[in-house]
């Protein structure tokens, strides 16, 4: 999904924000969660040749050449029971083929504690390079949008948000992008109902706090085993 009704982010205000690209075009967002790992929505890569994906860090304006960027390929994929029918567990971790250089424009995001739930009315920030609206193109400059957490019409298996009083929300191309609440990544943009930014239903995010132990175990495993295990399949293999 892309952000509809938002505003331009300050350049590199969100240095953990990642663009996933195919043939030079943005198709989903992601979040840098370790120097060599990004987190996105599972549906973003479900039908994609992951070997062709480029993971772009340090970007702001996708239509410009930016010296701040660091570009990686995907070495390995970790999924956690993604259910495309019921849109559950819409989370994927992509291991990069190298480690990012951490600097002012590229930084690792902070995650909440395992199981931490957001209450109704919490103010958060959604972001992304998704569509700017119906019949409008994809954003060149990263957009951000203030949203409110809602618990009505939202499963426990999601974090949901709504913008009250106007038509705004996430849209195509924003999928996989982070939802930032109190400085922590609490959501991964997953799906919308009633069309982009309809304001008629909450936007749904994968609930990062429900997956923190799993995320930590993957990052920890890679630190313990920096080299791929001999039995591991070839690069960009999927691991559940």
């Amino acid at each position: 999904s892309e952000i509809v009704g938002g505003r331009r982010a300050r350049p590199h205000a969100w240095p953990f924000m990642v663009s996933l690209q195919l043939r030079g075009g943005h198709f989903c967002g992601a979040t840098l969660i370790a120097p060599n790992f990004v987190m996105s929505a599972a549906h973003c890569v479900a039908n994609v040749n992951v070997r062709a994906v480029r993971v772009v860090l340090g970007a702001h304006n996708l239509s410009r050449r930016e010296p701040t960027r660091q570009v990686f390929a995907v070495q390995r994929i970790f999924e956690n029971g993604y259910d495309p029918v019921n849109l559950l567990n819409d989370i994927v971790i992509l291991q990069l083929n190298g480690s990012a250089t951490i600097n002012a424009n590229v930084q690792v995001a902070q995650l909440p504690a395992q199981g931490r739930r957001l209450g109704n009315g919490v103010q958060c920030l959604a972001m992304g390079w998704g569509l700017l609206g119906r019949n409008r193109g994809i954003a060149s400059v990263l957009q951000e949008l203030n949203v409110t957490v809602v618990t009505s019409l939202c499963r426990r298996s999601n974090v949901c948000t709504l913008v009250r009083g106007r038509q705004a929300g996430v849209c195509f191309g924003d999928s996989g992008s982070p939802l930032v609440c109190n400085g922590l990544i609490h959501g991964i943009a997953s799906f919308v109902r009633g069309g982009c930014a309809s304001g008629l239903y909450p936007d749904a995010f994968a609930p990062v706090a429900q997956f923190v132990n799993w995320i930590d175990s993957i990052i920890q495993r890679s630190e313990d085993n920096p080299c791929p295990h001999p039995r591991d399949p070839d690069p960009a293999s999927r691991t559940h």
């Epitope: 809602v150 009505s152 019409l153 709504l162 009250r164 009083g165 106007r166 038509q167 109902r193 009633g194 069309g195 309809s198 304001g199 008629l200 239903y201």
Partner: nanobody, 119 residues
Framework: EVQLVESGGGVVQPGRSLRLSCAAS????????MHWVRQAPGKGLEWVAV????????YYADSVKGRFTISRDDSTNTLYLQMNNLRAEDTAVYYC????????????WGQGTLVTVSS
């Protein structure tokens, strides 16, 4: 079985007000956005207004903006349309309709209630 039953229509003079109701049953009313749509004699359907699942967001056709107000009461599963400053061009059969969240379509309609604005 989903049922939507409109009421409150009638004959009214220009400039007067009318309040339409729509009683909903057979589904979890509070989970859905709801719409009002109208059809003037010999004309096509015209979308009038929509209210979000929780009532926080409301949108209107330009032709009724500032005159009509959509509201809902989830405790009684009822949708309302308050119509003020009615005009002759508001004469139509008014339908309430249930939203289909995934499709940007309306999947269930009521039988309609006729509003005639005439002096």
């Amino acid at each position: 079985e989903v049922q939507l039953v409109e009421s409150g229509g009638g004959v009214v003079q220009p400039g007067r007000s009318l309040r339409l109701s729509c009683a909903a049953s057979g589904f979890t009313f509070s989970n859905y956005a709801m719409h009002w749509v109208r059809q003037a004699p010999g004309k096509g359907l015209e979308w009038v207004a929509v209210i979000s699942y929780d009532g926080s967001n409301k949108y209107y056709a330009d032709s009724v903006k500032g005159r009509f107000t959509i509201s809902r009461d989830d405790s009684t599963n009822t949708l309302y349309l308050q119509m003020n400053n009615l005009r002759a061009e508001d004469t139509a059969v008014y339908y309430c309709a249930k939203d289909l969240p995934w499709e940007w379509e309306l999947d269930y309609w009521g039988q309609g209630t006729l509003v005639t604005v005439s002096s």
